[in-house]
Interface confidence: low
């Protein structure tokens, strides 16, 4: 059972003597005599696992210590870390030329965990060990312990994992520390992009490329990369994520947007407050939504204030001549915080006994400029009916309009048009003829254009060919011709007129009078 | 038909746990979130947080961490809420309710359908 | 946190009677606003949302009113279904809090 001790987050210790709980156990050859395992306490009263030799007195040492497997767990270069102290030669009476003042460091790359004898002609020497002048001084107690320390690597390895071995060759020594690990690169975010766990290359110059992901709520801008340095340090980054709409940049995250405020785009720029006349209810708001009565066109940036239709057009006035009208506003006095304002011009036709029994005016009216999208505030109407009421309403429009579910912003003119002449009769009929008289109906005027004060009936007898004619004049549609000669043919024209002066004559009505006191009932247009 | 029915009343003893369920129906349960709402005895309605159906992530009022736990299954279309160290104040009615997850067009939020409630007594 | 201030407490009334129930915000809560009905032992049932907004199958002789700060619920013509317990609730920023409530009981 390992307990945990901190060391550099690079490195990833695989193994750690001090934090072995109970005896190491290593095997040592020769098995007595040799390397020897002894605890000692340090100064928080912790057990420290060493193993010692000193046999210095006696010549041709050869003591061996190997560890147990270690794991590689993927690294291809690992390093060695002892503590070891290391007794002068200088400062043993009586050893010169047995005693010495180094060791060797070996390992064994095997795919086996279980070995259980030392080979020594399978391992490879990593180096000769020796103290230098740099130690630590350790309390154990009522001693102190210099203690030196020194890292070696070794690589490229490729089994699963390996063994170490330390050769004494005549010196005194105590093993205090034995770590091994290998350096990683550390999880990381730079640029918003994260970086994982890297174990660093097989050489100690050789640069491992990393492509990182970005962050959570973020998203690629150019591809995110950094190199994996030996030691286990990141070197260059390249590229970088942007946070996504509704998320800004905060202690190297991507975090939501506060309420009240929005982020429309993935940009590095931070959550911007909601605009005029609009709000966020939620955190992480792409976009803010318009206050009631506010509202955005398709084409508003998420950036512009919410907007209103604007109020009604003012000061609406009317000049009529004849059949055509000619209107003038001023602007709104709200244009709802919009430049696209423009004008809409509505035409209703409203009967004279009800106003209220409107209908659009179709498409014989003509408008000028136009009667839709009009920048300016006037207009012309031509092509009216005479003598009629219209309702003009004039629309002002702007780009949200459209969104407003109960529109007020139109002004309204009644107005009458002039009379004008009558159009023609298109029917005149005989309804009843005699010998010397002709009762003649008329339906009124398609188009009266005004009120009809009276209708003139004109006639003459064919064969005169209207240089002698009469007329008769009455208010109704209706009248009879008498005083007619018997057994001759009659020519009758009818003509309605309005204070604006006479209509056209109506097409001829042909009629002959009868020889016979008996009475004809007619209904044609050429009654015989 | 659109639901959520809760698990029936629980009667607990001081120290204890509850857990009480909101089970959705008729509707797609990741499109809304689940909201918690406490009604203690002759009292008016608290809402005591909220979790997101779509990632699990609760978010707690204050006074509502700590003891409380939400959590679901997706699996069956439930909401859990979970007290521990029951106190004779946890004594109330539980609500869930929901509330859409997104605007889906809707510019205001909510709770449209509640459950029926859950009545958690807490005595010795 | 926004508080939510409902007025009165309680009122007796009489089947077709009209009343009117107010809720004040302790800020502006632009018209986040829901208004619930609850009968004894029942859940709470949406009425109005957005302040203003019918939910589907309320009658109309409910409606809201309202911006800012304060915002009305009026019963038109009261009704013996009506007895109940009204609670507003804003939506503007959590936490989301209730009113205290309103009684309506028969007169």
């Known amino acids: 059972v390992t307990g945990s001790r901190v060391y550099p987050a690079n490195e990833v210790t695989l193994l750690d003597s001090r934090s072995v709980q109970g005896e190491l156990g290593w095997i040592a050859s020769p098995l007595e005599g040799g390397w020897e395992e002894v605890s000692i306490m340090d100064e928080k009263n912790t057990p420290i696992r060493t193993y010692q030799v000193c046999n210095v007195m006696e010549p041709s040492q050869n003591n061996w210590l190997r560890t147990d497997w270690i794991t590689r767990e993927g690294a291809q270069r690992v390093y060695i870390e002892i503590k070891f102290t290391l007794r002068d030669c200088n400062s043993l009476p009586g050893v010169m030329g047995t005693c010495k003042e180094t060791f060797n460091l070996y390992y064994y790359e095997s795919d086996n965990d279980k070995e259980r004898f030392i080979r020594e002609n399978q391992f490879v020497k990593i180096d000769t060990i020796a103290a230098d002048e740099s130690f630590t001084q350790v309390d154990i107690g009522d001693r102190i312990m210099k203690l030196n320390t020194e890292i070696r690597d070794v690589g490229p390895l490729s089994k699963k994992g390996f063994y170490l071995a330390f050769q004494d060759v005549g010196a005194c020594i105590a093993l205090v520390s034995v770590r091994v690990f290998y350096k990683k690169c550390p999880l990381t975010v730079r640029n918003l992009a994260q970086f994982p766990d890297t174990i660093t290359g097989a050489d100690t110059s050789s640069l491992v490329e990393v492509r990182g992901s970005c962050v959570n709520n973020s998203e690629e801008k150019d591809v995110p990369k950094m190199y994996c340095g030996a030691d286990g340090e990141w070197l260059v980054p390249i590229g970088n994520c942007l946070c996504n709409a509704g998320h800004e940049e905060r202690s190297g995250e991507c975090q939501a947007c506060k309420i009240g405020y929005y982020k429309a785009l993935s940009t590095d720029a931070t959550c911007a407050k909601c605009p005029p006349h609009s709000y966020s209810v939620w955190e992480g708001a792409t976009s803010c939504t318009c206050d009631r009565g506010f509202f955005r066109a398709d084409n508003d940036a998420a950036s512009m204030p919410c907007t209103r239709p604007p109020s009604a057009p003012l000061n609406l006035i009317s000049n009529v001549n004849e059949t055509s009208v000619n209107l003038e506003w001023s602007s709104p006095q709200n244009t709802g915080g919009r430049q696209d304002i423009s004008y809409n011009v509505v035409c209703k036709k409203c009967g004279a006994g009800d106003p209220s029994k409107c209908r659009p005016c179709g498409s014989g009216v003509h408008y000028t400029p136009q009667q839709n999208g009009l920048k300016t505030t006037k207009v012309s109407i031509t092509d009216l009916l005479a003598h009629t009421n219209y309702t003009f309403e004039i629309w002002a429009v702007n780009g949200v309009s459209k969104y407003n579910p109960n529109p007020d912003q139109s002004v309204s003119v009644t107005v009458t048009t002039n009379q004008a002449a009558p159009s023609s009769i298109a029917l005149v009929q005989a309804k009843e003829v005699t010998r010397y008289s002709v009762a003649l109906a008329w339906l009124e005027p398609d188009r009266p254009n005004g009120v009809i004060l009276e209708y003139e009936v004109k006639y003459y007898e064919k064969d005169q060919n209207e240089r002698s004619y009469r007329i008769v004049r009455t208010a109704a549609r209706n009248t009879d011709i008498k005083g007619l000669n018997p057994l001759t043919s009659y020519v009758f024209h009818v003509r309605a007129r309005t204070a604006a002066g006479y209509g056209d004559f109506s097409e001829p009505l042909e009629v002959t009078t009868n020889t016979v006191p008996s009475r004809i009932i007619g209904d044609g247009a050429n009654s015989t | 038909q659109i639901q959520l029915v809760q698990s029936g009343s629980e009667l607990k003893k001081p120290g204890a746990s509850v857990k009480v369920s909101c089970k959705a129906s008729g509707y797609t349960f990741t499109d809304y979130s689940m909201h918690w709402v406490r009604q203690a005895p002759g009292q008016g309605l608290k809402w005591m947080g909220w979790i997101n159906t779509e990632t699990g992530e609760p978010t707690y009022a204050q006074g509502f961490t700590g003891r409380f736990v939400f959590s679901l299954d997706t699996s069956v279309s439930t909401a859990y809420l979970q007290i521990s160290s029951l106190k004779a104040e946890d004594t109330a009615v539980y609500y869930c309710a929901r509330i859409p997850l997104y605007y889906y067009g809707s510019r205001y939020w909510y709770f449209d359908v509640w459950g029926q409630g859950t009545t958690v007594t807490v005595s010795s | 946190d926004i508080q939510m201030t409902q007025s009165p407490s309680s009122l007796s009334a009489s089947v077709g009677d009209r009343v009117t129930i107010t809720c004040r915000a302790s800020e502006n809560i632009y018209r986040n606003l829901a208004w619930y009905q609850q009968k004894p032992g029942k859940a709470p049932k949406l009425l109005l949302y957005?302040?203003?907004n019918l939910a589907d199958g309320v009658p109309s002789r409910f409606s809201g009113s309202g911006s800012g700060t304060d915002y009305t619920l009026t019963i038109s013509s009261l009704q013996s279904e009506d007895f109940a317990t009204y609670y507003c609730?804003?939506?503007?920023?959590?936490?989301?809090?209730f009113g205290q409530g309103t009684k309506v009981e028969i007169k």
């Open positions: 957005a302040a203003t």
């Open positions: 609730q804003h939506f503007w920023g959590t936490p989301w809090t």
